[in-house]
Amino acid sequence: AVNGTSQFTCFYNSRANISCVWSQDGALQDTSCQVHAWPDRRRWNQTCELLPVSQASWACNLILGAPDSQKLTTVDIVTLRVLCREGVRWRVMAIQDFKPFENLRLMAPISLQVVHVETHRCNISWEISQASHYFERHLEFEARTLSPGHTWEEAPLLTLKQKQEWICLETLTPDTQYEFQVRVKPLQGEFTTWSPWSQPLAFRTKPAALGKDT
């Protein structure tokens, strides 16, 4: 929802968290602001305090319940409001009717581990965190490998067009240090976006056997 120079963007992690960012040019200084969530079909409502992340933007996480509890479904709409204190009252600064399963951003994959490493190959696995059972297998992944002397931005993206929580990296250089990251995205949702990248996993390929051509 955009009001003039105000932008209010939220994502649902598919379980029990809605993360929001509100930005406004020339925003009010030293004012307490919060996001209020009011679902149209459920009994709970929730509030979080907006905290500054830059000169003109604030963020907060609406914690709806235990991390793995399913608090919303595809039938739900949540009214999200940015409220800022003006003296003794609260003023509505932004509002949106939020469809959680149209605005998904999952948690970054976790538990990355090297399953098997060789001189030229490395098999890596991971797990998804706090992802709804509603997706079944309707997820995709992107992965990237950081090679020596390169940046993450230069790393080519490997796309896994299915729910595959492992990858076999090939054509690696022996006895070389690498880092690996992965992210996940549901296929569902008009405004759904990629999760953050996972924490990087560092690994080293095995050295080539002595006296052998590599």
Partner: antibody, heavy 116, light 107 residues
Amino acid sequence: QVQLVQSGAEVKKPGASVKVSCKASGYTFTSHWISWVRQAPGQGLEWMGDIYPGSGNTNYNEKLQGRVTMTVDTSTSTAYMELRSLRSDDTAVYYCARERGGFDYWGQGTLVTVSS
Amino acid sequence: DIQMTQSPSSLSASVGDRVTITCRASQDISNFLNWYQQKPEGTLKLLIYYTSGLHSGVPSRFSGSGSGTDFTLTISSLQPEDVATYYCQQDNNHPYTFGQGTKLEIK
């Protein structure tokens, strides 16, 4: 206190239409979905659809094959359910219910009898 | 559509008994399961919402449990006024669906 009061019993001929009303009081009418549920004699409960009075948005059970229309009049806090092309198997008690994490308040029911 | 299957379809118990009614969903509905009581005259009341939430005004002898596909309504000590038909209902997805009902009688 929250109350949902429905219109009285109706007797209709096959092929006709019926419109049942549900007047809400004791809460903000525009803030909660209203569902319609029916129960044929000696049978279980069947969800027909729902309407959000704040926007007029509706969801219908496809089994009713486009024969149902739900509307609201926010000025009188009243919800309406119209069922067209009535058949004998539409004979049932029709209930309205407020939705808030389950149907937390129900109307008293309206008996609609379809008979030639 | 999600099918809801209740068991038993009817049961008879004595005052003071512990009574359990089960409900099974044809697919995972997380905790989006509600229980209703319908008295013989037709009046419907919400007892339990979101699997285990006790609706206001409902006696504490009623409780709910479960997750995913299997759910239970328990009456810890049956009272004469509990004679009714009990229904489970999923509000996980449209169309909402109900179990076929469990008719509870006093011995």
